[in-house]
């Protein structure tokens, strides 16, 4: 009876999300393997988040708008492990917008989700950021490694969206 009611709850939650995400990919987790964590298909999952690599080329504002339409934000990178996971799925000859910008050009970088910008957990390429006119951050592959670079926000780039996993 308990299992039945849990299944009914799950199905109704799935139906609720169905209107936003036609397909979800879920895995069982938790100490009793009773919880399901889901990401929209074909997003990838890492820890408690889902990621989507957008290959359409858009300015930073439009890229954030595009993520937002999908219930996400441009990616906020909190750890080296997270960055290493994300970069496995990126193309080395492309650049991707991050959810990091310096709106006034005062070198006050801020994340889209208001996570505090921690200088000790940043992965700028050597010599970057290098221009107060370049107020948005991308991740690209340079000198044999992935790192961040400041660029002009209005030049179209690919992007990475991130959202919290859906628990049912």
């Amino acid at each position: 009876n308990f299992m039945y009611s849990k299944t009914v709850k799950r199905l109704s939650k799935l139906q609720e999300y169905q209107q936003y995400y036609p397909s979800l990919t879920c895995v069982m987790e938790g100490k009793d393997m009773e919880d399901w964590s889901c990401c929209p298909t074909p997003w990838t999952s890492f820890q408690s988040s889902c990621y989507f690599i957008s290959t359409v080329m858009q300015s930073w504002t439009k890229s954030q708008n595009n993520c937002s339409v999908m219930g996400a934000d441009l990616v906020v990178i909190n750890t080296k492990e997270e960055q290493d996971f994300i970069t496995q799925n990126l193309k080395i000859n492309s650049a991707y917008f991050l959810g990091l910008s310096d709106p006034k050009g005062w070198r006050h970088w801020q994340w889209v989700d208001q996570t505090p910008y921690n200088k000790n957990v940043t992965f700028w390429h050597s010599g970057e950021p290098n221009s107060p006119d370049e107020r948005c951050a991308i991740i690209n592959f340079r000198s044999e490694e992935w790192g961040w670079n400041d660029v002009h926000c209005h030049v179209p780039q690919k992007s990475i969206c991130k959202m919290k996993k859906i628990y049912i």
Partner: antibody
């Protein structure tokens, strides 16, 4: 004010390459923005062909990807269009334009255009 | 690619009249739409960006509206210099495609 001017041969033979230059004055092409080639066919249809960004990256329209190359000479503040294996279908007026104005909401600055005819 | 369908293809009107040109996108372009005016033998001139914002110096008789996939350009009290061709262009995702154009002719 920024000004753009296209130049190049007005007549190209089929199967040859079309090469055009866009000379920019009043703004450095390495400072910001992205620098486009757009063409307008005889029936007036407009097509974005591709661009080169201020930092030297390219985007090419998928329909032209195998034939197009956009390069630049930063010392002369010029960017170039090269289109290979042209046919009579490539007859058009070719414009260069700056992209990224109004937070990338419209092309505010254009050259006056140059007519290229592909004919034997 | 997002396709832009513009209508009508041609339009005849008199000085002083009001005309409306429409543009339909094949997908939601989130108000990232520009309108241009082009005179014979000249390059297109940007009139409107982001669907409804007028470029500095463009007369207030021009106005843009719309959302989602449907947009329009309205010209009140047509002036002789308004005749020529009008084009819409979306700016949502690259490539930024144009509508087929509307030729506005004087009666």
């Amino acid at each position: 004010d920024v000004q753009l001017q296209e130049s190049g041969p007005g007549l190209v033979k089929p199967s040859q390459s079309l090469s055009l230059t866009c000379s920019v004055t009043g703004y450095s092409i390495t400072s910001a923005y992205y620098w486009n080639w757009i063409r307008q066919f005889p029936g007036n249809k407009l097509e974005c062909m591709g661009y080169i960004t201020y930092d030297g990256n390219n985007y090419y329209s998928p329909s032209l990807k195998n034939r197009i190359s956009i390069t630049r000479d930063t010392s002369k503040n010029q960017f170039f269009l090269n289109l290979n294996s042209v046919t009579t279908e490539d007859t058009a007026t070719y414009f260069c334009a700056r992209g990224g104005d109004y937070d990338d909401g419209g092309f505010a600055f254009w050259g006056q255009g140059t007519l290229v005819t592909v004919s034997a | 690619d997002i396709q832009m369908t513009q209508s009508p293809a041609s339009l005849s009107a008199s000085v002083g009249e009001t005309v409306t040109i429409t543009c339909r996108a094949s997908g939601n372009i989130h108000n990232y739409l520009a309108w241009y005016h082009q005179k014979q033998g000249k390059s297109p001139q940007l009139l409107v960006y982001n669907a409804k914002s007028l470029v500095d110096g463009v007369p207030s008789r021009f106005s843009g509206s719309g959302s989602g996939t449907q947009y329009s350009l309205r010209i009140n009290s047509l002036q002789p210099e308004d005749f020529g061709s009008y084009y819409c262009q979306h700016f949502w995702i690259v490539p930024y495609t144009f509508g087929g154009g509307t030729k506005l002719e004087i009666i």
